[in-house]
Amino acid sequence: EEELQVIQPEKSVSVAAGDSATLNCTVSSLIPVGPIQWFRGAGPGRELIYNLKEGHFPRVTPVSDPTKRNNMDFSIRISNITPADAGTYYCVKFRKGSPDVELKSGAGTELSVRAKPSAPVVSGPAVRATAEHTVSFTCESHGFSPRDITLKWFKNGNELSDVQTNVDPAGKSVSYSIRSTARVVLTRRDVHSQVICEVAHVTLQGDPLRGTANLSEAIRVPPFLEVTQQSMRADNQVNVTCQVTKFYPQRLQLTWLENGNVSRTEMASALPENKDGTYNWTSWLLVNVSAHRDDVKLTCQVEHDGQPAVNKSFSVKVSAHPKEQGSNTAAENTGTNERNIY
Protein backbone atom coordinates (compact mmCIF):
# COMPACT_ATOMS: atom_id res chain seq x y z
CA GLU A 1 0.00 0.00 0.00
CA GLU A 2 1.43 3.36 -1.08
CA GLU A 3 2.12 5.72 1.82
CA LEU A 4 -0.05 8.84 1.88
CA GLN A 5 1.73 12.03 0.83
CA VAL A 6 0.67 15.55 1.78
CA ILE A 7 2.00 17.79 -0.98
CA GLN A 8 2.52 21.51 -0.50
CA PRO A 9 4.18 22.39 -3.82
CA GLU A 10 5.30 25.94 -2.94
CA LYS A 11 8.00 26.40 -0.36
CA SER A 12 7.16 30.08 -0.21
CA VAL A 13 4.49 32.49 -1.40
CA SER A 14 4.71 36.28 -1.37
CA VAL A 15 1.68 38.57 -1.48
CA ALA A 16 0.91 42.23 -1.13
CA ALA A 17 -1.03 43.40 1.90
CA GLY A 18 -4.72 43.59 1.03
CA ASP A 19 -4.51 40.85 -1.60
CA SER A 20 -5.49 37.18 -1.31
CA ALA A 21 -3.03 34.34 -0.80
CA THR A 22 -3.56 30.85 -2.17
CA LEU A 23 -1.90 28.05 -0.21
CA ASN A 24 -1.88 24.85 -2.22
CA CYS A 25 -2.19 21.37 -0.75
CA THR A 26 -3.06 18.03 -2.32
CA VAL A 27 -3.04 14.50 -0.92
CA SER A 28 -1.88 11.47 -2.86
CA SER A 29 -4.56 9.12 -1.54
CA LEU A 30 -8.13 9.14 -0.25
CA ILE A 31 -7.26 6.67 2.48
CA PRO A 32 -7.13 6.56 5.39
CA VAL A 33 -10.38 8.45 5.97
CA GLY A 34 -9.95 11.62 8.01
CA PRO A 35 -9.97 15.41 7.82
CA ILE A 36 -7.37 17.93 6.65
CA GLN A 37 -6.60 20.94 8.82
CA TRP A 38 -4.45 24.00 8.17
CA PHE A 39 -2.16 25.41 10.83
CA ARG A 40 0.19 28.35 11.05
CA GLY A 41 3.42 27.36 12.74
CA ALA A 42 4.44 23.96 14.07
CA GLY A 43 4.60 22.36 17.47
CA PRO A 44 2.31 22.77 20.47
CA GLY A 45 1.79 26.52 19.96
CA ARG A 46 0.56 26.20 16.38
CA GLU A 47 -2.54 28.16 15.38
CA LEU A 48 -5.53 26.54 13.66
CA ILE A 49 -6.22 28.40 10.42
CA TYR A 50 -8.86 26.25 8.76
CA ASN A 51 -10.90 23.20 9.62
CA LEU A 52 -13.73 22.27 7.28
CA LYS A 53 -15.85 20.61 9.94
CA GLU A 54 -15.95 23.24 12.64
CA GLY A 55 -15.27 26.84 13.49
CA HIS A 56 -15.81 30.09 11.69
CA PHE A 57 -12.93 31.26 9.48
CA PRO A 58 -14.31 34.34 7.69
CA ARG A 59 -11.20 35.10 5.62
CA VAL A 60 -10.39 31.50 4.65
CA THR A 61 -12.17 29.65 1.86
CA PRO A 62 -11.37 26.32 0.20
CA VAL A 63 -10.20 26.60 -3.42
CA SER A 64 -12.16 23.49 -4.49
CA ASP A 65 -15.27 21.97 -2.96
CA PRO A 66 -14.01 19.85 -0.05
CA THR A 67 -17.37 18.03 0.23
CA LYS A 68 -17.06 16.73 -3.32
CA ARG A 69 -16.56 12.96 -3.62
CA ASN A 70 -12.93 11.89 -4.17
CA ASN A 71 -11.65 15.41 -3.50
CA MET A 72 -7.87 15.42 -3.04
CA ASP A 73 -7.31 19.17 -3.27
CA PHE A 74 -7.32 20.95 0.09
CA SER A 75 -5.87 24.25 -1.06
CA ILE A 76 -7.15 27.37 0.72
CA ARG A 77 -7.40 31.05 -0.11
CA ILE A 78 -6.89 33.66 2.62
CA SER A 79 -8.40 37.04 1.71
CA ASN A 80 -7.35 40.56 2.70
CA ILE A 81 -3.87 39.57 3.82
CA THR A 82 -2.14 41.75 6.40
CA PRO A 83 1.49 41.63 7.59
CA ALA A 84 0.23 39.81 10.69
CA ASP A 85 -0.63 36.82 8.46
CA ALA A 86 3.02 36.16 7.63
CA GLY A 87 4.36 32.80 8.74
CA THR A 88 4.68 29.16 7.70
CA TYR A 89 1.44 27.34 6.96
CA TYR A 90 1.09 23.55 7.25
CA CYS A 91 -1.51 21.34 5.65
CA VAL A 92 -2.03 18.41 8.05
CA LYS A 93 -3.85 15.10 7.42
CA PHE A 94 -5.63 13.41 10.34
CA ARG A 95 -6.91 9.81 10.69
CA LYS A 96 -10.56 9.68 11.70
CA GLY A 97 -11.04 8.61 15.29
CA SER A 98 -12.11 9.75 18.73
CA PRO A 99 -10.23 11.96 18.82
CA ASP A 100 -8.76 12.32 15.30
CA VAL A 101 -5.07 11.43 15.18
CA GLU A 102 -2.48 13.47 13.27
CA LEU A 103 -1.10 11.34 10.48
CA LYS A 104 1.06 13.47 8.19
CA SER A 105 1.99 17.09 7.62
CA GLY A 106 2.98 18.83 4.43
CA ALA A 107 6.42 20.45 4.23
CA GLY A 108 4.91 23.86 4.87
CA THR A 109 4.54 27.02 2.79
CA GLU A 110 6.08 30.22 4.05
CA LEU A 111 3.80 33.19 3.47
CA SER A 112 5.66 36.46 3.09
CA VAL A 113 3.69 39.71 3.07
CA ARG A 114 4.87 42.88 1.44
CA ALA A 115 3.24 46.01 2.85
CA LYS A 116 3.57 49.64 1.88
CA PRO A 117 4.75 52.22 4.39
CA SER A 118 2.12 54.64 5.63
CA ALA A 119 2.30 58.24 4.43
CA PRO A 120 5.14 59.92 6.34
CA VAL A 121 3.98 62.36 9.01
CA VAL A 122 6.33 65.24 9.75
CA SER A 123 6.08 67.14 13.01
CA GLY A 124 8.05 70.23 13.96
CA PRO A 125 9.05 71.93 17.19
CA ALA A 126 6.39 72.83 19.75
CA VAL A 127 7.64 76.41 20.08
CA ARG A 128 9.00 78.85 17.53
CA ALA A 129 12.70 79.66 17.35
CA THR A 130 14.59 82.57 15.83
CA ALA A 131 17.25 82.65 13.12
CA GLU A 132 20.57 80.96 13.85
CA HIS A 133 18.86 78.53 16.22
CA THR A 134 18.58 74.81 15.46
CA VAL A 135 15.16 73.15 15.42
CA SER A 136 14.28 69.48 15.08
CA PHE A 137 11.74 67.89 12.77
CA THR A 138 10.53 64.31 13.16
CA CYS A 139 9.23 62.02 10.42
CA GLU A 140 7.40 58.75 11.06
CA SER A 141 6.08 56.00 8.80
CA HIS A 142 4.66 52.64 9.84
CA GLY A 143 3.47 49.22 8.77
CA PHE A 144 5.90 48.36 6.00
CA SER A 145 7.49 45.06 5.09
CA PRO A 146 10.17 44.03 4.19
CA ARG A 147 12.36 46.05 6.56
CA ASP A 148 14.60 47.69 3.94
CA ILE A 149 13.63 51.33 3.52
CA THR A 150 15.34 54.61 2.72
CA LEU A 151 14.45 57.95 4.23
CA LYS A 152 15.86 61.28 3.08
CA TRP A 153 15.31 64.81 4.29
CA PHE A 154 15.33 67.90 2.09
CA LYS A 155 15.13 71.60 2.81
CA ASN A 156 14.09 73.60 -0.24
CA GLY A 157 15.28 70.72 -2.43
CA ASN A 158 18.69 70.35 -0.79
CA GLU A 159 19.36 67.12 1.09
CA LEU A 160 19.95 67.50 4.82
CA SER A 161 22.80 65.65 6.51
CA ASP A 162 22.18 66.25 10.23
CA VAL A 163 19.78 63.31 10.44
CA GLN A 164 19.25 60.38 12.80
CA THR A 165 17.07 57.47 11.62
CA ASN A 166 15.84 54.30 13.31
CA VAL A 167 13.90 51.33 11.94
CA ASP A 168 12.06 49.29 14.56
CA PRO A 169 12.04 46.57 15.64
CA ALA A 170 15.66 45.56 15.10
CA GLY A 171 14.81 41.85 14.88
CA LYS A 172 12.44 39.93 12.62
CA SER A 173 8.87 41.20 12.62
CA VAL A 174 5.73 41.05 10.51
CA SER A 175 5.99 44.81 9.87
CA TYR A 176 8.26 47.72 10.69
CA SER A 177 8.27 51.42 11.54
CA ILE A 178 10.75 54.16 10.76
CA ARG A 179 11.38 57.33 12.76
CA SER A 180 13.83 60.00 11.73
CA THR A 181 14.87 63.32 13.22
CA ALA A 182 16.44 66.12 11.18
CA ARG A 183 18.09 69.17 12.73
CA VAL A 184 17.70 72.40 10.77
CA VAL A 185 19.48 75.71 11.39
CA LEU A 186 17.00 78.55 10.78
CA THR A 187 17.75 81.71 8.82
CA ARG A 188 15.70 84.91 8.56
CA ARG A 189 14.82 83.89 4.98
CA ASP A 190 13.13 80.63 6.05
CA VAL A 191 9.52 81.81 6.34
CA HIS A 192 8.76 80.30 2.92
CA SER A 193 11.08 77.32 3.40
CA GLN A 194 9.84 73.74 3.54
CA VAL A 195 11.31 70.50 4.83
CA ILE A 196 10.40 67.26 3.10
CA CYS A 197 10.76 63.73 4.44
CA GLU A 198 10.97 61.24 1.56
CA VAL A 199 10.46 57.52 2.08
CA ALA A 200 11.31 54.92 -0.59
CA HIS A 201 10.35 51.25 -0.36
CA VAL A 202 10.22 48.28 -2.71
CA THR A 203 6.40 48.26 -2.62
CA LEU A 204 6.09 51.82 -3.91
CA GLN A 205 5.72 52.07 -7.65
CA GLY A 206 8.80 54.18 -8.21
CA ASP A 207 7.77 57.34 -6.42
CA PRO A 208 8.79 57.89 -2.82
CA LEU A 209 6.15 58.92 -0.31
CA ARG A 210 6.59 62.46 0.99
CA GLY A 211 5.68 64.27 4.16
CA THR A 212 6.19 68.00 4.46
CA ALA A 213 6.43 70.69 7.08
CA ASN A 214 6.59 74.44 6.59
CA LEU A 215 9.29 76.30 8.47
CA SER A 216 6.77 79.12 8.87
CA GLU A 217 5.32 77.02 11.70
CA ALA A 218 8.70 76.85 13.43
CA ILE A 219 10.29 80.24 12.91
CA ARG A 220 9.98 83.64 14.52
CA VAL A 221 11.60 86.60 12.79
CA PRO A 222 11.80 89.50 15.27
CA PRO A 223 11.09 92.99 13.91
CA PHE A 224 13.44 95.88 13.26
CA LEU A 225 12.18 99.18 14.70
CA GLU A 226 12.83 102.65 13.34
CA VAL A 227 11.27 105.86 14.65
CA THR A 228 11.33 109.01 12.52
CA GLN A 229 9.87 112.51 12.79
CA GLN A 230 8.40 114.30 9.80
CA SER A 231 8.54 118.11 9.37
CA MET A 232 6.68 120.28 11.85
CA ARG A 233 3.33 121.23 10.39
CA ALA A 234 2.00 124.79 10.34
CA ASP A 235 -0.42 123.93 13.18
CA ASN A 236 2.47 123.01 15.50
CA GLN A 237 1.76 119.28 15.11
CA VAL A 238 4.64 116.83 14.72
CA ASN A 239 4.06 113.56 12.85
CA VAL A 240 6.13 110.74 14.37
CA THR A 241 6.40 107.40 12.56
CA CYS A 242 7.29 103.98 13.99
CA GLN A 243 8.32 101.58 11.23
CA VAL A 244 8.27 97.91 12.23
CA THR A 245 9.88 95.81 9.51
CA LYS A 246 10.72 92.23 8.50
CA PHE A 247 8.80 90.35 11.20
CA TYR A 248 7.03 86.99 11.27
CA PRO A 249 4.48 85.83 12.32
CA GLN A 250 2.02 88.71 11.99
CA ARG A 251 0.95 88.60 15.66
CA LEU A 252 2.16 91.99 16.85
CA GLN A 253 0.94 94.72 19.20
CA LEU A 254 2.27 98.28 19.06
CA THR A 255 1.84 100.80 21.88
CA TRP A 256 2.69 104.52 21.81
CA LEU A 257 3.75 106.09 25.11
CA GLU A 258 3.94 109.85 25.71
CA ASN A 259 6.13 110.60 28.69
CA GLY A 260 5.53 107.05 29.92
CA ASN A 261 1.75 107.18 29.58
CA VAL A 262 -0.05 104.95 27.10
CA SER A 263 -1.29 107.06 24.24
CA ARG A 264 -2.55 104.40 21.82
CA THR A 265 -2.39 100.60 21.31
CA GLU A 266 -2.80 98.92 17.93
CA MET A 267 -2.86 95.30 16.75
CA ALA A 268 -1.41 94.30 13.38
CA SER A 269 -3.92 92.70 11.05
CA ALA A 270 -4.33 91.91 7.35
CA LEU A 271 -0.86 93.12 6.48
CA PRO A 272 0.54 92.60 2.98
CA GLU A 273 3.29 89.98 2.82
CA ASN A 274 6.82 90.77 1.74
CA LYS A 275 8.46 88.58 -0.91
CA ASP A 276 10.29 86.65 1.80
CA GLY A 277 7.08 86.03 3.77
CA THR A 278 7.77 88.62 6.47
CA TYR A 279 5.60 91.65 7.25
CA ASN A 280 6.13 95.41 7.60
CA TRP A 281 3.93 97.80 9.54
CA THR A 282 4.02 101.56 10.00
CA SER A 283 2.24 103.47 12.78
CA TRP A 284 1.92 107.27 13.05
CA LEU A 285 1.47 109.50 16.06
CA LEU A 286 0.59 113.21 15.87
CA VAL A 287 2.08 115.24 18.73
CA ASN A 288 0.78 118.74 19.40
CA VAL A 289 3.97 120.54 20.46
CA SER A 290 2.17 123.71 21.54
CA ALA A 291 0.27 121.73 24.18
CA HIS A 292 3.52 120.90 25.95
CA ARG A 293 5.79 123.16 27.98
CA ASP A 294 8.57 120.61 28.31
CA ASP A 295 10.18 118.07 25.97
CA VAL A 296 7.97 115.13 25.00
CA LYS A 297 9.45 111.65 25.41
CA LEU A 298 7.85 109.35 22.83
CA THR A 299 8.20 105.58 23.00
CA CYS A 300 7.18 103.05 20.35
CA GLN A 301 6.77 99.75 22.18
CA VAL A 302 6.36 96.56 20.18
CA GLU A 303 5.30 93.19 21.56
CA HIS A 304 5.84 90.47 18.92
CA ASP A 305 4.42 86.96 19.12
CA GLY A 306 4.24 86.94 22.92
CA GLN A 307 7.91 87.92 23.33
CA PRO A 308 9.17 90.65 25.71
CA ALA A 309 8.46 94.15 24.41
CA VAL A 310 11.04 96.03 22.36
CA ASN A 311 11.15 99.85 22.74
CA LYS A 312 12.40 102.76 20.67
CA SER A 313 12.25 106.17 22.42
CA PHE A 314 13.23 109.72 21.60
CA SER A 315 12.41 113.22 22.79
CA VAL A 316 10.64 115.92 20.87
CA LYS A 317 12.25 119.18 22.04
CA VAL A 318 9.64 121.83 22.64
CA SER A 319 11.37 124.81 21.01
CA ALA A 320 10.71 128.53 21.04
CA HIS A 321 11.52 128.38 17.33
CA PRO A 322 9.44 125.47 15.96
CA LYS A 323 9.89 126.54 12.34
CA GLU A 324 13.57 125.58 12.55
CA GLN A 325 12.50 121.97 13.06
CA GLY A 326 14.56 119.53 11.00
CA SER A 327 12.77 117.26 8.59
CA ASN A 328 12.64 113.48 8.66
CA THR A 329 14.99 112.76 11.55
CA ALA A 330 15.41 109.13 12.66
CA ALA A 331 16.01 107.64 16.06
CA GLU A 332 18.95 105.27 16.41
CA ASN A 333 18.04 101.67 15.71
CA THR A 334 19.51 100.01 18.77
CA GLY A 335 18.27 99.58 22.32
CA THR A 336 16.16 102.18 24.07
CA ASN A 337 17.12 105.46 22.56
CA GLU A 338 16.50 109.13 23.28
CA ARG A 339 17.01 111.82 20.65
CA ASN A 340 16.54 115.58 20.90
CA ILE A 341 14.84 117.03 17.85
CA TYR A 342 15.62 120.75 17.22
Epitope: A16, A200, V202, T203, L204, G206
Partner: antibody, heavy 116, light 109 residues
Framework: VQLVESGGRLGQPGTSLTLSCTVS????????MGWFRQAPGKGLEYIGI?????SPYYASWVNGRFTISKTSTTMDLKMNSPTTEDTATYFC?????????????WGPGTLVTVSS | DIQMTQSPSSLSASVGDRVTITCRAS??????LAWYQQKPGKAPKLLIY???FLYSGVPSRFSGSGSGTDFTLTISSLQPEDFATYYC???????????FGQGTKVEIK
Protein backbone atom coordinates in the same frame (compact mmCIF):
# COMPACT_ATOMS: atom_id res chain seq x y z
CA VAL B 1 -1.76 42.04 -20.07
CA GLN B 2 0.51 42.83 -22.99
CA LEU B 3 3.42 45.05 -23.98
CA VAL B 4 4.47 45.72 -27.57
CA GLU B 5 7.50 47.76 -28.60
CA SER B 6 7.61 49.65 -31.90
CA GLY B 7 9.80 52.18 -33.71
CA GLY B 8 12.85 50.00 -34.19
CA ARG B 9 14.55 50.62 -37.54
CA LEU B 10 17.80 51.37 -39.29
CA GLY B 11 18.96 54.81 -38.19
CA GLN B 12 21.84 57.16 -38.80
CA PRO B 13 24.34 58.02 -36.05
CA GLY B 14 23.42 61.33 -34.43
CA THR B 15 19.82 61.25 -35.64
CA SER B 16 17.39 60.92 -32.77
CA LEU B 17 15.04 57.97 -32.70
CA THR B 18 11.98 57.31 -30.55
CA LEU B 19 10.79 53.86 -29.52
CA SER B 20 7.31 53.26 -28.11
CA CYS B 21 5.91 50.63 -25.80
CA THR B 22 2.15 50.22 -26.07
CA VAL B 23 0.44 48.56 -23.13
CA SER B 24 -2.91 46.84 -22.81
CA UNK B 25 -4.70 45.14 -19.95
CA UNK B 26 -3.46 47.50 -17.22
CA UNK B 27 -2.93 51.17 -16.48
CA UNK B 28 0.45 52.85 -16.85
CA UNK B 29 -0.54 55.09 -13.94
CA UNK B 30 -0.35 52.09 -11.58
CA UNK B 31 3.02 50.54 -12.39
CA UNK B 32 6.67 51.31 -12.87
CA MET B 33 7.81 50.56 -16.41
CA GLY B 34 11.35 49.93 -17.57
CA TRP B 35 13.47 49.98 -20.72
CA PHE B 36 16.25 47.45 -21.33
CA ARG B 37 18.44 46.58 -24.27
CA GLN B 38 20.49 43.69 -25.56
CA ALA B 39 23.24 44.12 -28.11
CA PRO B 40 23.62 41.21 -30.58
CA GLY B 41 25.15 38.22 -28.77
CA LYS B 42 25.42 40.17 -25.48
CA GLY B 43 23.64 40.29 -22.15
CA LEU B 44 20.73 42.37 -20.87
CA GLU B 45 21.36 45.98 -19.91
CA TYR B 46 19.13 48.26 -17.84
CA ILE B 47 18.47 51.73 -19.31
CA GLY B 48 15.89 53.31 -17.01
CA ILE B 49 12.42 53.30 -15.53
CA UNK B 50 9.48 55.65 -15.33
CA UNK B 51 7.42 55.74 -12.15
CA UNK B 52 3.67 55.44 -11.92
CA UNK B 53 3.39 59.24 -11.70
CA UNK B 54 5.75 59.84 -14.62
CA SER B 55 9.13 60.53 -13.00
CA PRO B 56 12.00 59.00 -14.98
CA TYR B 57 15.08 57.42 -13.38
CA TYR B 58 18.11 56.32 -15.40
CA ALA B 59 21.06 53.96 -15.13
CA SER B 60 24.24 55.82 -14.18
CA TRP B 61 25.81 55.29 -17.62
CA VAL B 62 22.94 56.94 -19.52
CA ASN B 63 24.13 60.56 -19.04
CA GLY B 64 21.40 62.18 -21.11
CA ARG B 65 21.67 59.76 -24.02
CA PHE B 66 18.10 58.56 -23.49
CA THR B 67 14.85 60.21 -22.38
CA ILE B 68 11.91 58.22 -21.02
CA SER B 69 8.38 59.63 -21.04
CA LYS B 70 4.84 58.31 -21.15
CA THR B 71 1.23 59.03 -22.05
CA SER B 72 -1.82 57.14 -20.79
CA THR B 73 -1.17 54.03 -22.89
CA THR B 74 2.38 54.30 -24.21
CA MET B 75 5.85 54.67 -22.79
CA ASP B 76 8.50 56.22 -25.03
CA LEU B 77 12.28 55.95 -25.17
CA LYS B 78 13.98 58.73 -27.07
CA MET B 79 17.52 57.97 -28.25
CA ASN B 80 18.92 61.49 -28.30
CA SER B 81 22.07 61.08 -30.39
CA PRO B 82 22.55 57.39 -31.12
CA THR B 83 25.88 55.86 -32.03
CA THR B 84 26.69 52.48 -33.56
CA GLU B 85 27.15 51.13 -30.00
CA ASP B 86 23.40 51.63 -29.47
CA THR B 87 22.58 48.90 -31.97
CA ALA B 88 20.51 46.42 -29.97
CA THR B 89 17.12 44.89 -29.38
CA TYR B 90 15.19 47.18 -27.01
CA PHE B 91 12.71 45.70 -24.55
CA CYS B 92 10.10 47.37 -22.38
CA UNK B 93 8.94 45.61 -19.20
CA UNK B 94 6.58 46.10 -16.29
CA UNK B 95 7.47 45.59 -12.66
CA UNK B 96 5.64 43.00 -10.58
CA UNK B 97 2.55 43.80 -8.52
CA UNK B 98 4.44 43.13 -5.28
CA UNK B 99 7.20 45.65 -5.84
CA UNK B 100 9.73 47.27 -8.09
CA UNK B 101 12.55 44.74 -7.60
CA UNK B 102 11.61 42.47 -10.52
CA UNK B 103 9.96 42.63 -13.96
CA UNK B 104 7.27 40.05 -14.66
CA UNK B 105 5.90 41.17 -18.03
CA TRP B 106 8.11 41.86 -21.05
CA GLY B 107 7.48 42.97 -24.60
CA PRO B 108 8.89 40.93 -27.51
CA GLY B 109 11.48 43.61 -28.28
CA THR B 110 12.22 45.89 -31.23
CA LEU B 111 15.51 45.93 -33.13
CA VAL B 112 17.38 49.21 -33.59
CA THR B 113 20.33 49.28 -35.97
CA VAL B 114 22.45 52.41 -35.96
CA SER B 115 24.72 52.51 -38.98
CA SER B 116 26.14 55.07 -41.37
CA ASP C 1 27.13 50.76 -8.88
CA ILE C 2 26.59 47.15 -7.87
CA GLN C 3 28.26 44.47 -10.00
CA MET C 4 26.64 41.07 -10.49
CA THR C 5 28.97 38.17 -11.25
CA GLN C 6 27.29 35.08 -12.66
CA SER C 7 28.96 31.71 -12.94
CA PRO C 8 29.53 29.68 -14.92
CA SER C 9 29.18 31.70 -18.14
CA SER C 10 28.12 28.49 -19.89
CA LEU C 11 27.56 24.84 -19.04
CA SER C 12 26.70 21.62 -20.85
CA ALA C 13 24.21 19.25 -19.25
CA SER C 14 21.91 16.39 -20.11
CA VAL C 15 18.17 16.01 -19.67
CA GLY C 16 17.48 14.93 -16.08
CA ASP C 17 20.62 16.59 -14.68
CA ARG C 18 20.56 18.85 -11.66
CA VAL C 19 21.91 22.25 -12.67
CA THR C 20 23.11 25.02 -10.36
CA ILE C 21 23.90 28.60 -11.40
CA THR C 22 25.33 31.12 -8.95
CA CYS C 23 25.21 34.88 -8.83
CA ARG C 24 27.31 37.09 -6.57
CA ALA C 25 26.63 40.76 -5.82
CA SER C 26 29.49 43.19 -5.11
CA UNK C 27 27.56 44.39 -2.04
CA UNK C 28 24.52 43.23 -0.11
CA UNK C 29 21.21 43.39 -1.97
CA UNK C 30 19.35 41.53 0.81
CA UNK C 31 16.82 39.34 -1.05
CA UNK C 32 16.19 41.63 -4.01
CA LEU C 33 17.26 39.20 -6.70
CA ALA C 34 15.34 37.86 -9.69
CA TRP C 35 16.18 35.11 -12.18
CA TYR C 36 15.12 35.16 -15.84
CA GLN C 37 15.22 32.63 -18.66
CA GLN C 38 15.80 33.83 -22.22
CA LYS C 39 15.70 31.89 -25.46
CA PRO C 40 17.23 33.19 -28.73
CA GLY C 41 15.14 35.93 -30.36
CA LYS C 42 12.72 36.05 -27.41
CA ALA C 43 12.12 38.30 -24.43
CA PRO C 44 13.31 37.26 -20.96
CA LYS C 45 10.84 35.32 -18.79
CA LEU C 46 10.69 35.74 -15.02
CA LEU C 47 11.37 32.54 -13.07
CA ILE C 48 12.19 33.58 -9.50
CA TYR C 49 11.76 36.87 -7.64
CA UNK C 50 12.82 38.00 -4.19
CA UNK C 51 15.62 35.37 -4.31
CA UNK C 52 13.42 32.35 -3.59
CA PHE C 53 9.83 32.95 -4.70
CA LEU C 54 8.69 30.95 -7.72
CA TYR C 55 6.76 33.10 -10.19
CA SER C 56 3.30 31.82 -11.05
CA GLY C 57 3.22 29.29 -13.88
CA VAL C 58 6.92 28.43 -13.53
CA PRO C 59 7.57 24.68 -13.04
CA SER C 60 8.55 23.69 -9.51
CA ARG C 61 11.83 22.15 -10.73
CA PHE C 62 13.16 25.73 -10.65
CA SER C 63 14.14 27.04 -7.25
CA GLY C 64 16.14 29.96 -5.91
CA SER C 65 18.01 30.55 -2.68
CA GLY C 66 20.38 32.96 -1.00
CA SER C 67 20.41 36.44 0.48
CA GLY C 68 22.90 39.25 0.96
CA THR C 69 25.54 38.72 -1.73
CA ASP C 70 25.36 35.03 -2.76
CA PHE C 71 22.47 33.52 -4.69
CA THR C 72 21.73 30.26 -6.47
CA LEU C 73 19.31 29.13 -9.16
CA THR C 74 18.73 25.37 -9.21
CA ILE C 75 17.01 23.30 -11.86
CA SER C 76 16.35 19.98 -10.11
CA SER C 77 15.85 17.90 -13.25
CA LEU C 78 16.74 19.56 -16.53
CA GLN C 79 14.08 19.27 -19.25
CA PRO C 80 14.56 19.77 -23.02
CA GLU C 81 12.75 23.14 -22.90
CA ASP C 82 15.17 24.41 -20.23
CA PHE C 83 18.10 24.85 -22.63
CA ALA C 84 18.42 28.65 -22.68
CA THR C 85 20.39 31.54 -21.21
CA TYR C 86 19.70 32.48 -17.57
CA TYR C 87 20.23 35.94 -16.08
CA CYS C 88 20.21 37.17 -12.51
CA UNK C 89 19.04 40.71 -11.82
CA UNK C 90 19.50 42.73 -8.65
CA UNK C 91 17.67 45.73 -7.29
CA UNK C 92 19.44 47.91 -4.75
CA UNK C 93 16.98 49.52 -2.36
CA UNK C 94 19.22 52.51 -1.61
CA UNK C 95 20.31 53.47 -5.15
CA UNK C 96 17.04 52.06 -6.55
CA UNK C 97 18.92 50.79 -9.59
CA UNK C 98 18.99 47.46 -11.44
CA UNK C 99 21.96 45.36 -12.54
CA PHE C 100 22.07 42.13 -14.55
CA GLY C 101 24.57 39.33 -14.38
CA GLN C 102 26.34 38.54 -17.67
CA GLY C 103 24.26 35.41 -18.23
CA THR C 104 24.74 31.63 -18.12
CA LYS C 105 24.12 29.64 -21.29
CA VAL C 106 22.82 26.11 -20.59
CA GLU C 107 23.56 23.88 -23.57
CA ILE C 108 22.82 20.24 -24.40
CA LYS C 109 25.72 17.93 -23.67
Amino acid sequence: VQLVESGGRLGQPGTSLTLSCTVSGFSLSSYVMGWFRQAPGKGLEYIGIISSSGSPYYASWVNGRFTISKTSTTMDLKMNSPTTEDTATYFCARVGPLGVDYFNIWGPGTLVTVSS
Amino acid sequence: DIQMTQSPSSLSASVGDRVTITCRASQSINSYLAWYQQKPGKAPKLLIYSASFLYSGVPSRFSGSGSGTDFTLTISSLQPEDFATYYCQSWHYISRSYTFGQGTKVEIK
